[in-house]
Amino acid sequence: IPLSRTVRCTCISISNQPVNPRSLEKLEIIPPSQFCPHVEIIATMKKKGEKRCLNPESKAIKNLLKAVSKERSKRSP
């Protein structure tokens, strides 16, 4: 789950579960910073606007990131 805190990592727990790119409203990738030493990925789902913290090391999540970036590159002129 994500938690809104200013000087800490956002994610308290992370999920390995694959996410269907079509069910994604938004995908936030927060790079490492002075506040949090590792990358954080927060998915917002279309259904109910539910959010989920994703495990950047998970194979399923890496595949999701590839699929999303491919989709974006198709859309951009």
Epitope: I1, P2, L3, S4, R5, R8, C9, C11, I12, S13, I14, S15, N16, Q17, C36, P37, H38, K48, E50, K51, R52, C53, N55
Partner: antibody
């Protein structure tokens, strides 16, 4: 199967220390935030502390802040609660609970059986 | 700090009856952040409802949650003998503490 087992409870004098442990099995412990929740005899549930999956984030109830420390060892699949300067009002059953990671907030979906701490002179 | 109030303190009902439990917050809680737990004597709590209205895995459909803002409700449509227990609501706001309500005891009339 998914399981949490607490240990380390006992009878201790006021002002002394105790360390509780919670052994996790059956799930990817290193992905999950973990909580300690306590229940005084005949009373309701009181949230005590939370630690993030990676040990970076720690949060405490005001009643234990500065006295209790939550920690974890992901290589041993174990959660800890170091309790210092214990008071009579810390007497309770202490539960560890898993923060369910599959959503923004899905509650504490797995609980241990609890370990009893009695603070008495 | 958000304070949760549960009512009634005790609910005396018979098996087969409908139970309606209330949880009120001192300030608005996002419905994503509200959960309900059941606890039987000598046992650990069990997650029933998360996100105010979603049933946890394995929870029978006679349990339902509703509400938003400051008022939330847990309904048990037809009480089974195993449903007599204490029920707690809990909020998980954008920052701790993650407070529990004082509980509602559902006992046999």
């Amino acid at each position: 199967q998914v399981q949490l087992v607490e240990s380390g409870g006992g009878v201790v004098q006021p002002g002394r220390s105790l360390r509780l442990s919670c052994a996790a099995s059956g799930f990817t412990f290193s992905n999950c935030g973990m909580h300690w929740v306590r229940q005084a005899p005949g009373k309701g549930l009181e949230w005590v502390a939370l630690i993030g999956f990676d040990g970076i984030n720690e949060y405490y109830a005001d009643s234990v802040k500065g006295r209790f420390t939550i920690s974890r060892d992901n290589s041993k699949n174990t959660l800890y609660l170091q309790m210092n300067s214990l008071r009579a009002e810390d007497t309770a059953v202490y539960y560890c609970a898993r923060d369910w990671p599959e959503g923004y907030y899905n509650g504490m979906d797995v609980w241990g059986q609890g370990t009893t701490v009695t603070v008495s002179s | 700090e958000i304070v949760l109030t549960q009512s009634p303190g005790t609910l005396s009902l018979s098996p087969g009856e409908r139970a309606t439990l209330s949880c009120r917050a001192s300030q608005s809680v996002s419905s994503s952040y509200l959960a309900w737990y059941q606890q039987k004597p000598g046992q650990a709590p069990r997650l029933l409802i998360y996100g105010a209205s979603s049933r946890a895995t394995g929870i029978p459909d006679r349990f339902s949650g509703s509400g938003s803002g400051t008022d939330f409700t847990l309904t048990i449509s037809r009480l089974e003998p195993e449903d007599f227990a204490v029920y707690y609501c809990q909020q998980y706001g954008s920052s701790p503490p993650f407070t529990f309500g004082p509980g509602t005891k559902v006992d046999i009339k």
